[in-house]
Amino acid sequence: LNTTILTPNGNEDTTADFFLTTMPTDSLSVSTLPLPEVQCFVFNVEYMNCTWNSSSEPQPTNLTLHYWYKNSDNDKVQKCSHYLFSEEITSGCQLQKKEIHLYQTFVVQLQDPREPRRQATQMLKLQNLVIPWAPENLTLHKLSESQLELNWNNRFLNHCLEHLVQYRTDWDHSWTEQSVDYRHKFSLPSVDGQKRYTFRVRSRFNPLCGSAQHWSEWSHPIHWGSNTSKENPFLFALEA
């Protein structure tokens, strides 16, 4: 069974050293081999995937995952109840919404069941690991002859998100971008009616409710301009 795990682009860096350099290799036992790092992402606070690189193991190993929350009512050790697999080897754990407590320190322990001393424990701040779904329902309103307003929706508490709007015309080689706070609207004050514009938006769980570094996927683009303006000069909805 192969499970595809949604993770944003650019979140991995495989340049880290193999870090048993302080011990001679001939003295390594199984229990001193490092376990892979666990990386967790909370998707729209609906579920969380904690994954690891199972192929880094010297031989195929079904590593097990336990978790708990530090200093809380949820500090009882829990076993993973929904493993993710890569080529029939455990490579992650999925936690459901009821198991996610954003503002408590999440402790995750990876263990080799054949060598119980071989374990690694990590601590994570889940509020910094939230990735919202991409913005939806983009709409454009013509506020005046030369001014456009872009609106969108998020399937999350709007005040928790910041946004990045990108737009360009068919004449542009690159995107122009503008940061937008939790208000999820953007105005373009000067529009050239002879050009066709494309807009897209992405969102991030930052800075009011968390300090996430990762953005959502980009929304579907929406277009406005020369070849659409004759249809309805006041409202243009999503064009995929």
Epitope: N11, D13, T15, E37, Q39, Q119, N128
Partner: nanobody, 126 residues
Framework: QVQLVESGGGLVQAGGSLRLSCAAS????????MGWFRQAPGKEREFVAV???????FYADSVEGRFTYSRDNAKSAVYLQMNSLQPEDTAVYYC????????????????????WGQGTQVTVSS
């Protein structure tokens, strides 16, 4: 290869303060998870404070609110400010480092750290 050297330990009265320093050489602190651990006589080594290179810091329950971890990447040094010290804080304090791929990785398990300092003794008298 990373070399770690701790300093700042000593004898202090209960309620007093100390600031431990850990100087790293051999490479920069970038992409290193760092930790402070301690070992009291006859006890296992335990984590005190750990930090991911992305900036998240975590403390053991017993020191939360009294100890503060900080990192100075420019000086390749990390620090542990220890206030309101108690006799039960008496131990050898160790600095540790682990290269990690992810900015969020902060290990509280001592066996996850590849590099260790020689330790500095902290004694708190009542």
């Amino acid at each position: 290869q990373v070399q770690l050297v701790e300093s700042g330990g000593g004898l202090v009265q209960a309620g007093g303060s100390l600031r431990l320093s850990c100087a790293a050489s051999g490479r920069t602190l970038s992409r290193l998870a760092m930790g402070w651990f301690r070992q009291a006589p006859g006890k296992e080594r335990e984590f005190v404070a750990v930090n991911s290179w992305g900036g998240d810091t975590f403390y053991a329950d017993s020191v939360e609110g009294r100890f503060t971890y900080s990192r100075d990447n420019a000086k390749s040094a990390v620090y542990l400010q220890m206030n309101s010290l108690q006799p039960e804080d008496t131990a050898v304090y160790y600095c540790a480092a682990a290269p990690t791929s992810f900015a969020t990785t902060a290990y509280s398990s001592s066996n996850s750290y590849a590099y260790w300092g020689q330790g500095t003794q902290v004694t708190v008298s009542s």
